[in-house]
Every structure is written in structure tokens, then in C-alpha cells.
Interface confidence: medium
């Protein structure tokens, strides 16, 4: 991850130190302050690419407009998806909890993190950089960012271990309520999700930098002791590893078992009977990869450009300017990507779920209205209850309805 | 190759305005990180900065000639132009313009003035 | 401003002898430029962040320091670095240039 208007270039190189989720903009600048201003080689200063700033100049208005956006759609739209699971009964379910923590996760990201960033890339400085407030501020930042992105991804694995449940155990019966088991996973979620975050808040400091003979502030990651140094070095593998593989890993063995599961389980009279209720789960599992597959997509270029700098590019390297050009632009569009991943899940279930579609539709223009939600039980073999929407859309069996309330 | 020339009147009269260009090649001031700058030598004396001018627009002046000195630039035509108003016997000198490269380094930047003019000689006489 | 006071004004040295000059800034600074001027020659960049040759300076000549005082060395002295040598800092606003050392060969 600053002063007030010094220069347009002051502005880019506070950039340059951007947090964003889940990086921190390292191209032009190393990450940490070096202990002397000293160089590697001989002359090696003199070697320097000339459209870095350019790139970097471009880009702070882009995602000035994108930030804007994204804070209003992420806004809207998440706090709607919060207002319809809680507010209707029938949407209060395993999966829907689950749902929900991922939108209070991009929610707070979206109304805290990001005017900070567009106040930074506007002013040019960080907020506050001078009294106590920015100190805090530095820590808050970064820290609601890893712990953002990683209620997304730990939401994501959670959502995926509960669509095999679901199928594993087709014919166990619940109500309407969020599991005990789906709470417990919510509460660790977020709490493994700040305890990964920590080290965020304790690398990330106020640091004075000299620009154009004025001292400036601006909040970057600064390793102090050896943990940090460590953490600092392994931070792009450790970023890549847990926070984009974990989730595709987990989601791609969750849903392989899942698979398999289904095709064990193809023929009996079970299976025709639950005909609609597997048919239901089917598309609540294809709304839950509906989500992952857009996780993957908002995130890739972030970290392939992450880890090419981290493999790839060489500094001493002659020739590396073509290649930096490409990865800061690479860097770019996955950072305005990776923002957008905060805002874009609400209208993916918007598209995906035909319920949040109603009920966003409903919502948005008065109130997710309980009448299109008139439930009458029926009994079904004895071992689940049929809940029947008067939506002919709608036909919902045990957890379909209630565990599976998104389509 | 970068190359840096200074050219000016040669000889004026003091109260006079002053009015020299740098004509530079080698290298553009649309590029970022790059600046130009003027520094005077009186004759046998030290080095003096006067001012300076960066790709971006932002300008920079000594403070004890602020109201004197203005520093303007053509990307287009590459040249950098320095006037200094009201001058005086005290302002006769060599006066050389240089590139100035700005590099992030760390945190912190480094400035460096790497290719000079050869100078142009200023009088000031009555 | 930060006043940058060289010393000394005017040296001599002989063929091989190790020469330092010193440069002290009234303030902190981050780093220190230096700059060799022969007569009738504009400045060349000589030294930049403290301790970096510029290309084509010889190896012999080496910078070091921080804070307030910085030094210009030369471990053996040759005809050719006779000239008079500029610290300059950019820590703060404005630019300055040291008075100079001129260095001359005994």
C-alpha cells in the first residue's frame, strides 16, 4: 500500500504502493524500506524503463471510475443479498448462511477498503498520513483486505464441502434454519480469516520517503523481525497457494465426490421419487461452482502476474522493460478484476438462482414481499417434507427448499 | 546519444529580462522520470541550481530567485526555456542545463543530473 | 536549506597517494551526488547514491557516508583527477551544490 497534490508523479508512486486485495503493488519499488541506498551493480540506476509511470498514470484514473463503480454495485447489491436472506425465512438456510457471510465479507471490504484506496489514488497520499488516525488506518487496510478475500475463499471451500454433504446425506431432513454445523463453519471462517490476516496489521506501517526533496508518508508493508522478513518473501506463493488453489483444489474434490456420489446413486426407486429434489440440488451445486468459476476468473491474472514477477522477471536484466510493461498492465487489470470480485456475486446469483432473482427483483424495488413466499408443508415417504412455493417455478423438497433456497 | 545545448544573448544590460533555451536530443520530456534543469557557474566559483522542470509539468525554483526565474518547457520541439527578469551584474555566469533522471529506488527516489550542456556564457554589463 | 560545506577548499596530492574530501550538510540527508568539473569542462556526474559510480568513472574513486557527513575517496592518485570535485544533495528543497574541493596533483 502521500501528499496533498506535489506532483502528478507522487501520486503514481504512491500507487505503486497500493494494497490491494491480497497484493501490494511491489513493481517499481522493492517492498520494504532498504536499510542503505545502495546499489547492486555498477551503474545499474542508469538502466530504467520509461513507461512504467505512464502505465501507472492511465491506471489511476481507470480505477478511480472502476473503484466508484464497484463501491456502489458491491454496496447494493451485497447489502440486498443480506436484506433477502435475513428477511425472508425460507431464504435462512445452510448454503444461504453461507452466502450471506460471503457477502458481509465483501461488504466491509467495499464500504471501508475501497474509498481509501480512491481517496489515495485521487489525493495522491494517504488519508491522515500525518496523525494517529492514518497509523490505523495503514493497519485496518490491508489487514480487512487478507481477511476479505480470505472469508471469500474459506466461504467458497465451505460452500463446496456442503454441496457433497447434501448429496452424501440426500435424505437427511432439516428445517427452516441455519444448521448448527453451517454457524460453527461461519464463526471459524471468520476467525481463521483475521488470524491470517494478522501479520497484515503488523507488517504494514506509515514509512517516511523523500520525493522531489519533500518528506512524505505513505503505508507499506516494512519488515521488522524475522517472521515478517519471512512472511514478506513467501507472501506471493503463500497469497497464490491458500487463497486461489485452496479454494479450486477443495471445490474440485468437493464436487468430483459429489459426482461420483450422483452416479453411484443413479438408479432406485429413491431416486426417482427425489427426482425434483436432486434436480434442485443440481442447480444449487451449480450456482455454488457458478461462484468458484467466477472466483477463479476475477483472481487469475493478479496472481499469474504475481508470481511471473516473482519467477520471471529479472531486474538486471537488459531487455526486462517489455516484459514489466506487460506485467504491470497484467497487474492492473487483475487488481480492477480482483476488486471486482467483492461486487460480482450478488449479480451472479442474480443470473444464476431464479429465487434471488425474484427476491433481488422484489427487494430492490420495495421489499423481498412475503406473499410469493406462502409455504405449505406436505408430507413426502415419510422422511422429508415437501415445501411448496406457490411459484410453480419453485418446487422445493427438504433441504432444496431450505438448505437449497437458491434457485 | 543524449545531447544538451544551452544558447542565449550573450550579453545584456543590466534591468533586462534574460531569456536562454536548452535544445536537447537523445531522449524526450513526454518520458517519465525525466526533467530539466538549469544550474549557473559564475566565473570561477561554485555551482548554483536555479531551477527545474519535469516531464509531468511540476517545477521547482530556487527560493532566493523565485520571483525572478520562470522555467518553461516544448516537449514537441525539445526545449526547456529559463527567463530570469531584472537581472543584474550578479547574474553574469556560465549557465548549463542538464538532464535530470528521477528513479524510484527503495522507498525513497534518487535524482541525478547525468548528461550536461557545455554552457553558455551570460554578461551582465552596462 | 541544507548548506553543504566541503573540505577542504583546495587540496593537493601526489601520483598514488589516497586522497578524501569530505562533505557536511547542516541537515540529514538521504544520500549525496558528486560531481567532477575540469576548467574550461561542464560537471560530470562522478558519484550518485552515496556510493555508486557514474559509467566510465574508474574504480579507484569510491563514495561513502550518511546522514551528515559524506566522503569522496581516491585510494591512488592519478594525473587525471585533478579537478575540482561538487557534493550535491536532493533531500530537500532546494538542490545544493557543496563550494567545492579542487584537487591538485603535487
Known amino acids: 500500500d502521500n501528499p496533498e497534490r506535489y506532483s502528478t508523479n507522487l501520486s503514481n508512486h504512491v500507487d505503486d504502493f497500493t494494497t490491494f486485495r491480497g497484493t501490494e503493488l511491489s513493481f517499481l519499488v522493492t517492498t520494504h524500506q532498504p536499510t542503505n541506498l545502495v546499489l547492486p551493480s555498477n551503474g545499474s540506476m542508469h538502466n530504467y524503463c520509461p513507461q512504467q509511470t505512464k502505465i501507472t498514470s492511465a491506471f489511476k484514473y481507470i480505477n478511480t471510475v472502476i473503484s466508484c463503480t464497484i463501491f456502489i454495485v458491491g454496496m447494493v447489491g451485497n447489502a440486498t443479498l443480506l436484506r433477502i436472506i435475513y428477511q425472508n425465512k425460507c431464504m435462512r438456510n445452510g448454503p444461504n448462511a453461507l452466502i450471506a457471510s460471503l457477502a458481509l465479507g465483501d461488504l466491509i471490504y467495499v464500504v471501508i477498503d475501497l474509498p481509501i484506496n480512491v481517496f489515495k489514488l485521487l489525493a495522491g497520499r494517504w488519508p491522515f498520513d500525518h496523525n494517529d488516525f492514518g497509523v490505523f488506518l495503514c493497519k485496518l487496510f490491508p489487514f480487512l483486505q487478507k481477511s476479505s478475500v480470505g472469508i471469500t475463499v474459506l466461504n467458497l471451500c465451505a460452500l463446496s464441502v456442503d454441496r457433497y454433504r447434501a448429496v452424501a446425506s440426500w435424505s437427511r431432513v432439516q428445517g427452516i434454519g441455519i444448521p448448527l454445523v453451517t454457524a460453527i463453519e461461519i464463526v471459524s471462517i471468520w476467525i481463521l480469516s483475521f488470524i491470517l490476516a494478522i501479520p497484515e496489521a503488523i507488517g504494514f506501517v506509515m514509512v517516511p520517503f523523500e520525493y522531489r526533496g519533500e518528506q512524505h508518508k505513505t503505508c507499506m508493508l516494512n519488515a521488522t523481525s524475522k517472521f515478517m522478513e519471512f512472511y514478506q518473501d513467501v507472501k506471493d506463493w503463500w497469497l497464490f497457494g491458500f487463497y486461489f488453489c485452496m479454494p479450486l483444489v477443495c471445490t474440485a474434490i468437493f464436487y468430483t465426490l459429489m459426482t461420483c456420489e450422483m452416479l453411484n446413486r443413479r438408479n432406485g426407486s429413491l431416486r426417482i421419487a427425489l427426482s425434483e429434489h436432486l434436480k434442485q440440488r443440481r442447480e444449487v451445486a451449480k450456482t455454488v461452482f457458478c461462484l468458484v468459476v467466477i472466483f477463479a476468473l476475477c483472481w487469475f491474472p493478479l496472481h499469474l502476474s504475481r508470481i511471473l514477477k516473482k519467477t520471471v522477471y529479472n531486474e538486471m536484466d537488459k531487455n526486462r522493460c517489455e516484459l514489466l510493461s506487460f506485467l504491470l498492465l497484467m497487474d492492473y487489470i487483475g487488481i480492477n478484476l480482483a476488486t471486482m470480485n467483492s461486487c460480482i456475486n450478488p449479480i451472479a446469483l442474480y443470473f444464476v438462482s431464479k429465487k434471488f432473482k425474484n427476491c433481488f427483483q422484489s427487494c430492490l424495488c420495495c421489499c423481498c414481499y412475503q406473499s410469493k413466499s406462502l409455504m405449505t408443508s406436505v408430507p413426502m415417504n415419510g422422511t422429508s417434507i415437501q415445501w411448496k412455493n406457490h411459484d410453480q417455478n419453485n418446487h422445493n423438497t427438504d433441504r432444496s427448499s431450505h438448505k437449497d433456497s437458491m434457485n | 546519444q543524449v545531447t544538451l545545448k544551452e544558447s542565449g544573448p550573450g550579453i545584456l544590460k543590466p534591468s533586462q529580462t534574460l531569456s536562454l533555451t536548452c535544445s536537447f536530443s537523445g531522449f524526450s520530456l513526454s518520458t517519465s522520470g525525466l526533467g530539466v534543469g538549469w544550474i549557473r557557474q559564475p566565473s570561477g566559483k561554485g555551482l548554483e541550481w536555479l531551477a527545474h522542470i519535469w516531464w509531468d509539468d511540476d517545477k521547482y525554483y530556487n527560493p532566493s530567485l523565485k520571483r525572478q526565474i520562470t522555467i518553461s518547457k516544448d516537449s514537441s520541439r525539445n526545449q526547456v526555456f529559463l527567463k530570469i527578469t531584472n537581472v543584474d551584474t550578479a547574474d553574469t555566469a556560465t549557465y548549463y542545463c542538464?538532464?535530470?533522471?528521477?528513479?524510484?529506488?527503495?522507498?525513497?527516489?534518487?535524482?541525478?543530473?547525468?548528461?550536461w550542456g557545455q554552457g553558455t556564457s551570460v554578461t551582465v554589463s552596462s | 536549506q541544507i548548506v553543504l560545506t566541503q573540505s577542504p577548499a583546495l587540496m593537493s596530492a601526489s601520483p598514488g597517494e589516497k586522497v578524501t574530501m569530505t562533505c557536511s550538510a547542516s541537515s540529514s540527508v538521504s544520500y549525496m551526488c558528486w560531481y567532477q568539473q575540469k576548467p574550461r569542462s561542464s560537471p560530470k556526474p562522478w558519484i550518485y547514491l552515496t556510493s555508486n559510480l557514474a559509467s566510465g568513472v574508474p574504480a579507484r574513486f569510491s563514495g561513502s557516508g550518511s546522514g551528515t557527513s559524506y566522503s569522496l575517496t581516491i585510494s591512488s592518485m592519478e594525473a587525471e583527477d585533478a579537478a575540482t570535485y561538487y557534493c550535491?544533495?536532493?533531500?530537500?528543497?532546494?538542490?545544493?551544490f557543496g563550494a567545492g574541493t579542487k584537487l591538485e596533483l603535487k
Open positions: 542538464a538532464r535530470r533522471r528521477e528513479v524510484n529506488f527503495g522507498i525513497n527516489y534518487y535524482y541525478s543530473m547525468d548528461y
Open positions: 550535491q544533495q536532493w533531500s530537500s528543497n532546494p538542490p545544493t
